[in-house]
Amino acid sequence: QPNNSLMLQTSKENHALASSSLCMDEKQITQNYSKVLAEVNTSWPVKMATNAVLCCPPIALRNLIIITWEIILRGQPSCTKAYKKETNETKETNCTDERITWVSRPDQNSDLQIRTVAITHDGYYRCIMVTPDGNFHRGYHLQVLVTPEVTLFQNRNRTAVCKAVAGKPAAHISWIPEGDCATKQEYWSNGTVTVKSTCHWEVHNVSTVTCHVSHLTGNKSLYIELLPVPGAKKSAK
């Protein structure tokens, strides 16, 4: 068992390898065809370590001439994955990440998949479909979400520290009850942020404090009983 003055509680969400997709089935394609084509760009938050499937505009493959996926990742040259129907050939340019692949053969399925999404997959993904009727685009601003690790501990009398470590985007920390708090943010080179909130409670009838961490990947609460003030022996409540 840890000492009360040391780290008392930690939490790290564990995600089974889930899949997320914005793709639609055939029925939806029929209903939403014009709407989807109008909605060219989509912001899409995806949890790290899940699988993601990105879709092209809902164009029947028989009408296709060329499909191109353009992938723009931070600090990388633009990667393109192209499929030409007439010659049944695929071509890749500047694509080095083996986790980003066609879902299956592009003549059967034009979707792109990212296996085990990482922070480095943050970026812009665009499918361009060339047809006799013109070019159709669909873009994704992929925002990779990282669940922060949450810790709560005491470092001195009636002062508690709550940390949300390496979250993306930054988590928000609140307390019950409210205390006299100072919050700092530390930005890491990989795009994650550590938020540290240090609070002091002068009011002596506060027994237990709760740190509530709000994040796009889910919320987490931890609580801790405050240590007594040194020298304080007896108190009637």
Epitope: Q1, P2, T208, V209, T210, Y223, I224, E225, P230, A232
Partner: antibody
Framework: QVQLVQSGAEVKKPGASVKVSCKAS????????MHWVRQAPGQGLEWMGN????????NYDEKFQGRVTMTADTSTSTVYMELSSLRSEDTAVYYC???????WGRGTLVTVSS | DIQMTQSPSSLSVSVGDRVTITCQAS??????LHWFQQKPGKAPKLLIS???NLESGVPSRFSGSGSGTEFTFTISSLQPEDAATYYC?????????FGQGTKLEIK
């Protein structure tokens, strides 16, 4: 896993005192508040107070102020709750609890009867 | 002191039904709480800690929600063994205070 073992049932006369013990194991005894809660027959739960064994710091509910004394023996990891000037309405099961109320003893029945 | 108003005080429900119990803290003061189950002659058993965390070994039909001053305890599908009295406990402020209890009977 935290275990709290309480002393056995007591029968006392009005005006007497009773001392209930609670021996803790499975956690750092001096680092967690220990609380006492009582429950009269057919009634709800009532918090009496708490003690921090590491410093001896205590909080008593004002209802029991002057009649209750909580102490801790760090050498045996045991806390004590003594209630004096007993009256019939003090007949209750007395529980010790720790780890922010997540671990409870089995309770000690104190019967006050003439 | 923070008063915890728990309702209802009693209810009689059929097996398989959904049960909801609420606790509200007085003075509009935000608190944190636990939910306990107590059967006759036994110590209270912690079911939900910190308003919404299901304790290890507790069936998933039990759940807790809410924050601030209003909290809800739910049994999604009542089982015969759930007949008991249920209490909330606020542990943010001294003195700690319990709700008055909800006695749950099976029809």
């Amino acid at each position: 896993q935290v275990q709290l073992v309480q002393s056995g049932a007591e029968v006392k006369k009005p005006g007497a005192s009773v001392k209930v013990s609670c021996k803790a194991s499975g956690h750092t005894f001096t680092s967690y508040w220990m609380h006492w809660v009582r429950q009269a027959p057919g009634q709800g739960l009532e918090w009496m107070g708490n003690i921090y064994p590491g410093s001896g710091s205590i909080n008593y509910d004002e209802k029991f102020q002057g009649r209750v004394t909580m102490t801790a023996d760090t050498s045996t990891s045991t806390v004590y709750m003594e209630l004096s000037s007993l009256r019939s309405e003090d007949t209750a099961v007395y529980y010790c609890l720790t780890m922010t109320g997540t671990s409870w003893g089995r309770g000690t029945l104190v019967t006050v009867s003439s | 002191d923070i008063q915890m108003t728990q309702s209802p005080s009693s209810l009689s429900v059929s097996v398989g039904d959904r049960v909801t119990i609420t606790c509200q803290a007085s003075q509009g003061t935000p608190i944190n709480l636990h939910w306990f189950q107590q059967k006759p002659g036994k110590a209270p058993k912690l079911l939900i800690s910190g308003a919404s965390n299901l304790e290890s070994g507790v069936p998933s039909r039990f759940s807790g929600s809410g924050s601030g001053t209003e909290f809800t305890f739910t049994i999604s599908s009542l089982q015969p063994e759930d007949a008991a009295t249920y209490y909330c406990l606020q542990f943010t402020y001294i003195p700690w205070t319990f709700g008055q209890g909800t006695k749950l009977e099976i029809k």
